[in-house]
Amino acid sequence: CKAMHVAQPAVVLASSRGIASFVCEYASPGKATEVRVTVLRQADSQVTEVCAATYMMGNELTFLDDSICTGTSSGNQVNLTIQGLRAMDTGLYICKVELMYPPPYYLGIGNGTQIYVIDPEPCPDSDF
């Protein structure tokens, strides 16, 4: 297993609709054709694999399971969007990138993006 640098923004504020987007960029040492990206959330004394995607370079990301994530790739950048977030989901979201093929296997883990989620204020009752 060889180490690889992964960069991601330090802080992102989710939209009022509970959507947060950030870029995960990795310094690929070679010409990887198969890449796996995992988003981990570290907060509340938990480590959760939020979503994971495997993609072939140049193709769309295919997320596994009931994913709350979507994303696109462009070169060594992955644009990730996490949906359905609530205030209690605020935490450190870490981007983990694995170059699966061809060998050698490379692993990179970012420092994390602190995502802040603020639940929208309920609309006041209206007489209209």
Partner: nanobody
């Protein structure tokens, strides 16, 4: 809704291992994320581990990461919790729970179906 029955609890010495099982009855087991929670004497219910519908995603409490492993067999409608290197702080009633869909954080309020629990006692 899914009905859940836990098994495998018991008395084990500190440093030992134990395996819990949770059998689910009902349809579409693979549509549910499954979790384990525990309640220790005098403490609130605590998240332990969870696994997504197809078993590709997991979540662990910091206190058990590296010692406990969650897995599932969708063909058998069963979720498992393998517990290694147990210590006295792991003594609790362990509950299996189910929720629809996955999430960024694991909270008991998001789990709608619960088993009756199985007692795990670690003696030192």
């Amino acid at each position: 809704e899914v009905q859940l029955v836990e098994s495998g609890g018991g008395l084990v010495q500190a440093g030992g291992s134990l395996g819990l099982s949770c059998a689910a009855s009902g349809r579409s087991f693979s549509m549910y994320a499954m979790g384990w929670f525990r309640t220790a004497p005098g403490k609130e219910r605590e998240f332990v581990a969870a696994i997504s519908g197809s078993g590709t995603l997991t979540s662990y409490a910091d206190s058990v990461k590296g010692r406990f492993a969650i897995s599932r067999d969708n063909a058998k409608n069963t979720v498992y919790l393998r517990m290694n290197n147990l210590n006295a702080e792991d003594t609790a009633v362990y509950y299996c729970a189910a929720r629809s869909g996955w999430g960024a954080a694991m909270r008991s309020a998001d789990f709608r179906s619960w088993g009756q629990g199985t007692q795990v006692t670690v003696s030192s």
